[in-house]
Amino acid sequence: SIPWNLERITPPRYRADEYQPPDGGSLVEVYLLDTSIQSDHREIEGRVMVTDFENVPEEDGTRFHRQASKCDSHGTHLAGVVSGRDAGVAKGASMRSLRVLNCQGKGTVSGTLIGLEFIRKSQLVQPVGPLVVLLPLAGGYSRVLNAACQRLARAGVVLVTAAGNFRDDACLYSPASAPEVITVGATNAQDQPVTLGTLGTNFGRCVDLFAPGEDIIGASSDCSTCFVSQSGTSQAAAHVAGIAAMMLSAEPELTLAELRQRLIHFSAKDVINEAWFPEDQRVLTPNLVAALPPSTHGAGWQLFCRTVWSAHSGPTRMATAIARCAPDEELLSCSSFSRSGKRRGERMEAQGGKLVCRAHNAFGGEGVYAIARCCLLPQANCSVHTAPPAEASMGTRVHCHQQGHVLTGCSSHWEVEDLGTHKPPVLRPRGQPNQCVGHREASIHASCCHAPGLECKVKEHGIPAPQGQVTVACEEGWTLTGCSALPGTSHVLGAYAVDNTCVVRSRDVSTTGSTSEEAVTAVAICCRSRHLAQASQELQ
Amino acid sequence: QEDEDGDYEELVLALRSEEDGLAEAPEHGTTATFHRCAKDPWRLPGTYVVVLKEETHLSQSERTARRLQAQAARRGYLTKILHVFHGLLPGFLVKMSGDLLELALKLPHVDYIEEDSSVFAQ
């Protein structure tokens, strides 16, 4: 029978006669930076080329016994998970191995850097098809390792890494914390985060998605036909490297941003039991388990978006947090969130020729997060329209006035410490759909975009008094681009997008009583691209 | 023993190739920064990645490495250039005493220096 992990990544709509990947990743080369490997293992024989690259530290311990099977254990298993004949994800992918970890599984940042440089030079000397680099290793946060990963990613290489097995925030480790790298956490057969004794999978905003990483059957270096089960975020990352190889083989022109968005889009949503994560990390950790797309040509027509959380601003009064999209993604909206509820909103602003999302802490606040909605929108022309606080009138409004521009997101930012003491209007004037409306003491920012065939609509869901959270979702075929709260008073903790649902969190004031003025509305902006849909139909 | 001889050879070369006209002052602009792993047990003091500014050419990287060796030698310190980076990041990997960090941070073209550290299979 099919191992649980391969079954898990196979799409739910899978039928043997329908989903037959033509080549299983044959156009893609996967580089593995790990221990030495047993290249003559039947699972990977002829599929893995061992390069002459080796940069490893000496083993610890005075009486260490170097045994080939132990030296090769980790790398052999991972090569098998990526492309093994029987138990591999991308059975057609070819691999190249670089030895950066010693027999004890230990390496150095410098050795890894030299390995990444070796890959870049190989790519320049002999350009091949799409490249995937698997980094099933982790160390403490390293500026230089993250920088090298960024450079390699910008050279068109897809990097996939283990989130780390420290039951900790992945942002404290490298290369897991590098934004350009696809960082993978581990889940088990019950879709629970993997526990490894006291430790376990890392979590947090630096994780892109999870994948199977417990009791994974793969090639064992004990003999050329042996199999063994291993666990860890390395195994999870190997699954995603295999899925990436399949996707790139089917669509070799995919950029890193497109690949990441597809991986997120085709993942199983909301299946992980979040109670395992520390409470303050649950909202930041993606509830996504990687899966193969239901067909090899898919989804070109869809408007893809993902949510990017910033680092925490810290508690100082003027502290801010910035969330950024990848270079070839568009920032379509910006929101903010504070656990204490003390924040001064958020705004979209230009930085280095690109829009970023900045959230502002308030006096007495424990800090804020900025939340960017980052989307793939070819040929887009987006701008931010701002209206200063209206002060005397019913509320501040701003709309997209340029011809052909549609509203994709609303943000509001205020200088007063507590909007709650400045009561918003009871009645919210309803204007055109291309309009953002907010508190009269706040400046309002509208994200307005022009892109071929882009259409958007506003969806709202309000409840009379705050009860923890209000949600509103976009329907099938539409993608959530903007998520904000009305009226934005002090009991609103913030708004953020989870997949295609806009979540507005507020303090539960049901115990203290409420008035109609304390009603909270979640406002979602849902968009789709007729142009992308037509282009996709023309291809078929 | 071989390692020590290698170090000695490099030291002599560094002294020979010293360029008289080289000033020791850093370039104008921002000061280079030093980074190290937050987890002490994973630190590998004595080996450092010197990262140079983005547009630095390979020849400048090599020259900066030589200059560090020369200035270190003048202070009686042995250094060993383990690798010169180019292709991804400009810079070099150097084995040296932590006492030389202040000196290295003042070299021209230096963006930041990071102490080497361990990574582990996951």
């Epitope: 311990g61 009486r63 260490f64 004794g197 006291t198 | 047990p41 299979a121």
Partner: antibody
Framework: QVQLVESGGGVVQPGRSLRLSCAAS????????MHWVRQAPGKGLEWVAL????????YYADSVKGRFTISRDNSKNTLYLQMNSLRAEDTAVYYC???????????????WGQGTTVTVSS | QSVLTQPPSVSAAPGQKVTISCSGS????????VSWYQQLPGTAPKLLIY???KRPSGIPDRFSGSKSGTSATLGITGLQTGDEADYYC???????????FGTGTRVTVL
């Protein structure tokens, strides 16, 4: 559930030998380093030995070096401590304990057995 | 003779806070991860803190750890009678190539 059960303790004369066993259950034994720790009556904890998850590395306290041998059988999920040339000062409760992780053996111990008593007396 | 020094005893009233220090050197606390263990009377030790300040699941946040230079500290807030026990710090010692425990501290709830 995760469990460690020590056995093999008893009363033994000085100079004689004893072999302690520790049966592990409820976790993947081969993925974790294992320690032996002892506690003399009314005294504090004293670390005795550590073996890596795959048996490739062994470490001993100076007080037992050359006399005690730590080993493991991953197929039987069992840890052993062979104690030779026993002395009166080896009298203690001996605990086996699981290392928090395989590779980061210096992280400490997260699961402990209930202990087995060794008395060395003539 | 332990290379990690702890005070022999500390005491406080219920609900109060106590701190236990653990002093070492650069070869142990200075450059290695510190763990803290609780040993209730007549039982095996139990892990309270690892990696200086991380708590295993099930350990209440009344227990906290910190490190500064070559010393580590365990803090216990909201002291309860059930906290009466011996507490040990522990870390790897790179020069000894072995694990070392502190001398142990008895906590008494008055």
């Amino acid at each position: 559930q995760v469990q460690l059960v020590e056995s093999g303790g008893g009363v033994v004369q000085p100079g004689r030998s004893l072999r302690l066993s520790c049966a592990a259950s409820g976790f993947t034994f081969s993925s974790f380093g294992m320690h032996w720790v002892r506690q003399a009556p009314g005294k504090g904890l004293e670390w005795v030995a550590l073996i890596w998850n795959d048996g490739s590395n062994k470490y001993y306290a100076d007080s037992v070096k050359g006399r005690f041998t730590i080993s493991r059988d991953n197929s039987k999920n069992t840890l052993y401590l062979q104690m030779n040339s026993l002395r009166a000062e080896d009298t203690a409760v001996y605990y086996c304990a699981r290392a928090i992780a395989a590779l980061y053996y210096y992280y400490g111990m997260d699961v402990w057995g209930q202990g087995t008593t060794v008395t060395v007396s003539s | 003779q332990s290379v990690l020094t702890q005070p022999p005893s500390v005491s406080a009233a219920p609900g109060q806070k106590v701190t236990i220090s653990c002093s070492g050197s650069s070869s142990n606390i200075g450059n290695n991860f510190v763990s803290w263990y609780q040993q209730l009377p007549g039982t095996a030790p139990k892990l309270l803190i690892y990696d200086y300040n991380k708590r295993p699941s099930g350990i209440p946040d009344r227990f906290s750890g910190s490190k500064s230079g070559t010393s580590a500290t365990l803090g216990i807030t909201g002291l309860q009678t059930g906290d009466e026990a011996d507490y040990y710090c522990g870390t790897w010692d790179s020069s000894l190539s072995g694990y070392v425990f502190g001398t142990g501290t008895r906590v008494t709830v008055l």
